[in-house]
């Protein structure tokens, strides 16, 4: 697994531990919390990166606080259980046996149960909506220079292949970014579009999971893109099971 | 390969304030955390305070609030610590640290002394 | 705050013997601890951080073991370029160091 050898850390995830003990003393790291072993050229699975961050040092909440733009973090933390590939397993339970289904960024996606839930098999979110509110700014961005700028920024911060940067729609001061994967197009190695919102998501809160990379610094000719809002939106490769009772509340 | 520079020798009256600067190169300046540690004669290693480059926000040690104020410049990737209201006490060589992702401090200055005499 | 308690606070050993110094933190930090090398005139050295984990270059004499409150630093067989004061540091919740253990050679 490629990780920088000369002081032996992940460039890619700063919340593993790295030691020169692979073989023949190559370094290798591992994630917090799961012990996994990671791949340090590509980014790691949301699954494992939940999983650190439930274990990750105190200093990782208190001395990194969220930039001033950032949302209010309700995204559900919880400690998930992971496959052996670093993938969420379809069903999720806490230390009370309370149980349910989750898609493939963790995101529940049927009521609540205890264990007797059966979760059948990961369904795959294939279709994820960043809605983008940008702070005011003299004038709007130019619509094709922005475009070009966030098709950049995956490609090259999150590795993303720009086929699955499916549109970037923009109507000041709302950018909205739609990545698209179904199970098909996905091929070995890509970078699933699950992890690389993720990663944007922890990016634009400050909190970015790259080690030694400064925050976000995204410019669009030059003109700073601060972003003030987001919101960001899964869709199921099969839509998601609650009870009508949840619908109407 | 990653340095960490500091500014050399001072020597203080009582009352009085020093700054000392740390300059850093060799790794991106915004993407790790620097800190600042005590080292009294005779003494153990104290952990003084810390700052994140990249936003400049700073948590201090209780013991030494009010004492220091530490900043950054990003332009030329130096952090600076002022120690105000200078006694005796304050005697000591004073080291910053970088702060790996973990936090741990994994490169160091190679320390600056500070005299307070009258 | 979190209190590191170090010992012994010195130590005489002979080249060649198994060095043990302990540090034992007020609550439970995980396995955020490292160990540091400090010489006179020198800027500490990281050694071993994640309790046992050793940092790149750092001789495979040098161990460390523990979890929760409790953290042995072993040197298997001292040398004499290993006379230096030890520290802990734990980086769970904010940073303390431990008082030092200062290592004298026989």
């Known amino acids: 697994h490629t990780a920088a050898q000369d002081n032996c850390t992940c460039p890619t995830n700063k919340m593993t531990v790295c030691s020169p003990d692979g073989p023949g003393g190559r370094c290798q790291c591992r994630a917090l919390g799961s012990g996994m072993a990671v791949d340090c050229s590509t980014l790691t699975s949301k699954c494992l990166l939940l999983k650190a961050r439930m274990s990750a040092p105190k200093n990782a909440r208190t001395l990194v606080r969220p930039s001033e733009h950032a949302l209010v973090d309700n995204d559900g933390l919880y400690d998930p259980d992971c496959d052996p590939e670093g993938r969420f397993k379809a069903r999720q339970c806490n230390q009370t046996s309370v149980c349910w289904c989750v898609n493939s960024v963790g995101v529940r996606r049927t009521d609540k149960g205890d264990l007797s839930l059966r979760c059948d098999e990961l369904v795959r979110t294939h279709h994820i909506l960043i809605d983008l509110r940008h702070r005011p700014t003299a004038g709007a961005f130019n619509h094709s220079d922005l475009d070009a700028e966030l098709r950049r920024l995956f490609r090259e911060r999150y590795r993303l292949h720009p086929k699955f940067v499916a549109a970037v729609h923009y109507e000041q001061p709302t950018i909205q970014i739609e990545l698209r994967q179904n199970t098909s197009q996905k091929a070995a190695g890509d970078v699933d579009i699950g992890d690389a919102a993720y990663y944007f998501e922890r990016d634009i809160k400050g909190e970015s999971l790259f080690q030694g990379r400064g925050g976000l610094d995204l410019r669009v000719r030059g003109e700073p893109l601060q972003v003030e809002r987001t919101l960001i939106y899964y869709l199921d490769e099969i839509p998601p099971k609650f009870s009508m009772k949840r619908l109407t509340a | 390969q990653v340095q960490l520079v500091q500014s050399g020798a001072e020597v203080k009256k009582p009352g009085a304030s020093v700054k000392v600067s740390c300059k850093a190169s060799?790794?991106?300046?915004?993407?790790?955390?620097m800190n600042w540690v005590k080292q009294a004669p005779g003494q153990g290693l104290e952990w003084i305070g810390i700052?994140?480059?990249?936003?400049?926000?700073?948590t201090y040690n209780q013991k030494f609030q009010g004492k220091v104020t530490i900043t950054v410049d990003k332009s030329t990737s130096t952090v600076y610590m002022e120690l105000s209201s200078l006694r005796s006490e304050d005697t000591a060589v004073y080291y910053c640290?970088?702060?790996?992702?973990?936090?741990?401090?994994?490169?160091w200055g190679q320390g600056t002394t500070v005299t307070v005499s009258s | 705050d979190i209190q590191m308690t170090q010992s012994p606070s010195s130590l005489s050993a002979s080249v060649g013997d198994r060095v043990t110094i302990t540090c034992q933190a007020s609550?439970?930090?995980?396995?955020?601890l490292a160990w540091y090398q400090k010489k006179p005139g020198k800027a500490p050295k990281l050694l071993i951080h994640?309790?046992?984990n050793l940092q790149t270059g750092v001789p495979s004499r040098f161990s460390g073991s523990g979890s929760g409150t409790d953290f042995t630093f072993t040197i298997s067989s001292l040398q004499p370029e290993d006379i230096a004061t030890y520290y802990c540091l734990q980086y769970d919740d904010l940073f303390t160091f431990g008082q030092g253990t200062k290592l004298e050679i026989k």
């Open positions: 640290a970088r702060g790996a992702g973990l936090y741990y401090f994994d490169y």
């Open positions: 609550q439970d930090i995980n396995k955020y």
């Open positions: 700052i994140n480059p990249y936003q400049g926000d700073t």
């Open positions: 994640y309790t046992s």
């Open positions: 060799g790794s991106s300046f915004t993407g790790y955390t």
